[in-house]
């Protein structure tokens, strides 16, 4: 004997998130009277998506004239899907009873699932500044993404990076997911104006990847160099000493002269040069004048670099001697200038 | 009044796909609360269907023929079109497209003259 | 699918008499069953629908009676233009079914 069947035609529908999904169903007969309901996952449980005789759902419309006499089809779309609409649906005809209506016969029900695109990949670097040769850590994270696979690359200046570990949570089935992966990059000298970027590829991007980006600028610390130099003016009783602070980032630099132990001035780095490679170079000189001292002059360069440790250079000046040439240095950096007379 | 117009090759070969369009003048098939159905009829025997179509796109086929039969629709041109699949001499028929209330008042209430397909090499 | 016989197949009357055909489904089908007029060589028109209702336009002497499993068409007073062959169709399960057919001929 013939038996109304429900038809559930598609066994898995895929959607987008923000589009309108489509779940077909065709009940057989028109015998026994009575409505259809379409519910969400199955058992004492289930959520209810729609009901043909009664209730508001603002999200779905039935495909076709469900509330037509002669009508089998029991279609509906969902509209701006969203990864929580995920889950397996199903199309159930209810036999007309007293005072309820009974469940007849349920369809095979039908999967949907929803594409979802990851959120921009955000990376971030260590808290702290590390200097060239250390190993630092970056993060990057992506969320709200499905399916669940997905790829994930790190870059460093267009070279792909080997030392990175990758996890995409949760592990078990999910709505939606989220990426997390540690990338370690060694620190060079050169890594001023270096990027490191996150790229991450999904089904849903199309072949057209998304990217977060960090500048190593933001994370690395490049120590100065020191050298002090004397020079002679044409006053004979003058002597110019400089500090070259070289090779430095970032630009953040207090230098304090001292005279043999005691500080004489304190400067900040103002008027600093760029090199190519993105660290500064900086010159502070002093005017001295010889004939003041009896006895020799220890002078002392120091520099406080970001907040570091001083690191110092010193440069002994004998009084004694006539004033000659002790040490040049005419670089096309040494822009900076600050003169100090000692008498 | 609506009417409906069949209108394909009277010829198909076996093993071919037999293809008609159904025209639909003085109503809309867009506009709702009918099945577009097609039916056809061997030489001499009785009427058999075999499924129909909703403007949405929706359809229901008849499983003896499930395999072999799609029905599309074209809103914007007001027609339904058949497709029948590996054809043999047992698809040569008077094929008929017509209307068919969905709100059974009507029933198939409009039906077109019919064509005659033949299946023969 | 759901059966539908049609008897008799052929029956041959004189004008003005009362024709009856039967049309018996092979379960339950409530009242989703429509009758069909088919001359030759031209498609079918609906007479009956929803067992007993009759179309807008139809003569009044068509009428159809029946529910559940066995229907009834009927024709009060035969006409020559009834020489046709009629249907009944159910569409109370899908696939929509027709019965064989019931040839009215005039004696």
């Known amino acids: 004997e013939e038996e109304l069947q429900v038809i559930q035609p598609d066994k898995s529908v895929l959607v987008a998130a923000g589009e309108t999904a489509t779940l077909r169903c065709t009940a057989t007969s028109l015998i026994p009277v009575g409505p259809i309901q379409w519910f969400r996952g199955a058992g004492p449980g289930r959520e209810l998506i729609y009901n043909q005789k009664e209730g508001h759902f603002p999200r779905v419309t039935t495909v076709s004239e469900s509330t037509k006499r002669k009508n089998m089809d029991f279609s509906i779309r969902i509209g701006n899907i969203t990864p929580a609409d995920a889950g397996t649906y199903y199309c159930v005809k209810f036999r007309k009873g007293s005072p309820d209506d009974v469940e007849f016969k349920s369809g095979a029900g039908t999967e949907l699932s929803v594409r979802a695109k990851p959120s921009a990949p955000v990376v971030s670097g260590p808290a702290a500044r590390a200097t060239p040769q250390h190993t630092v850590s970056f993060t990057c994270e992506s969320h709200g993404f499905s399916p669940r696979d997905i790829t994930l690359k790190w870059f460093k200046n267009g070279n792909e990076l080997s030392d990175f570990q990758t996890n995409v949570d949760p592990v078990g089935e999910s709505v939606s997911y989220s990426i997390h992966s540690t990338a370690k990059v060694v620190l060079t000298r050169e890594d001023v104006h270096s990027q490191v970027i996150c790229e991450v590829a999904h089904v849903t991007l199309q072949g057209d990847p998304l990217r977060g980006t960090a500048n190593l600028s933001e994370t690395i610390r490049v120590p100065p160099t020191l050298e002090v130099t004397q020079q002679p003016v044409r006053a004979e009783n003058q002597v110019n000493v400089t500090c070259q602070v070289r090779k430095f980032y970032p630009q953040r630099l207090q230098l304090t002269w001292l005279e043999n132990g005691n500080v004489s001035r304190t400067e900040t780095a103002s008027t600093v040069t760029e090199n190519k490679d993105g660290t500064y170079n900086w010159m502070s000189w002093l005017l001295v004048n010889v004939s003041a001292h009896r006895d020799d002059v220890k002078l002392t360069c120091q520099v406080e670099h970001d907040g570091q440790p001083a690191v110092s250079k010193s440069h002994d000046l004998k009084v004694s001697a006539h004033p000659k040439e002790q040490g040049s240095n005419t670089a096309a950096e040494n822009t900076g200038s600050n003169e100090r007379n000692i008498y | 009044q609506v009417q409906l117009q069949e209108s394909g090759p009277g010829l198909v070969k076996p093993s071919q796909t037999l293809s008609l369009t159904c025209t639909v003048s003085?109503?809309?098939?867009?506009?709702?609360?009918?099945?577009w159905s097609w039916i056809r009829q061997h030489p001499g025997k009785g009427l058999e269907w075999i499924g129909y179509?909703?403007?949405?796109?929706?359809?229901y086929y008849n499983p003896s023929l499930k395999s072999r039969v799609t029905i599309s629709v074209d809103t914007s041109k007001n027609q339904f079109s058949l497709k029948l699949s590996s054809v043999t001499a047992a698809d040569t028929a008077v094929y008929y497209c017509?209307?068919?209330?969905?709100?059974?008042?009507?029933?198939?209430?409009?039906w077109g003259q019919g064509t005659l397909v033949t299946v023969s090499s | 699918d759901i059966q539908l016989t049609q008897s008799p197949s052929s029956l041959s009357a004189s004008v003005g008499d009362r024709v009856t055909i039967t049309c018996q489904a092979s379960?339950?089908?409530?009242?989703?069953l429509n009758w069909y007029q088919q001359k030759p060589g031209k498609a079918p028109k609906l007479l009956i629908y929803?067992?007993?209702n009759l179309e807008t336009g139809v003569p009044s002497r068509f009428s159809g009676s029946g529910s559940g499993t066995d229907f009834t068409f009927t024709i009060s007073s035969l006409q020559p233009e009834d020489i046709a062959t009629y249907y009944c169709?159910?569409?109370?399960?899908?696939?929509?079914?027709f019965g064989g057919g019931t040839k009215v001929e005039i004696k």
């Open positions: 179509i909703y403007y949405s796109g929706s359809t």
């Open positions: 003085g109503g809309s098939i867009s506009s709702g609360g009918y099945y």
């Open positions: 929803d067992a007993s």
């Open positions: 379960q339950d089908i409530s009242n989703y």
């Open positions: 017509a209307r068919e209330g969905l709100d059974g008042s009507y029933g198939s209430s409009a």
């Open positions: 169709q159910q569409f109370a399960y899908l696939p929509y079914t």
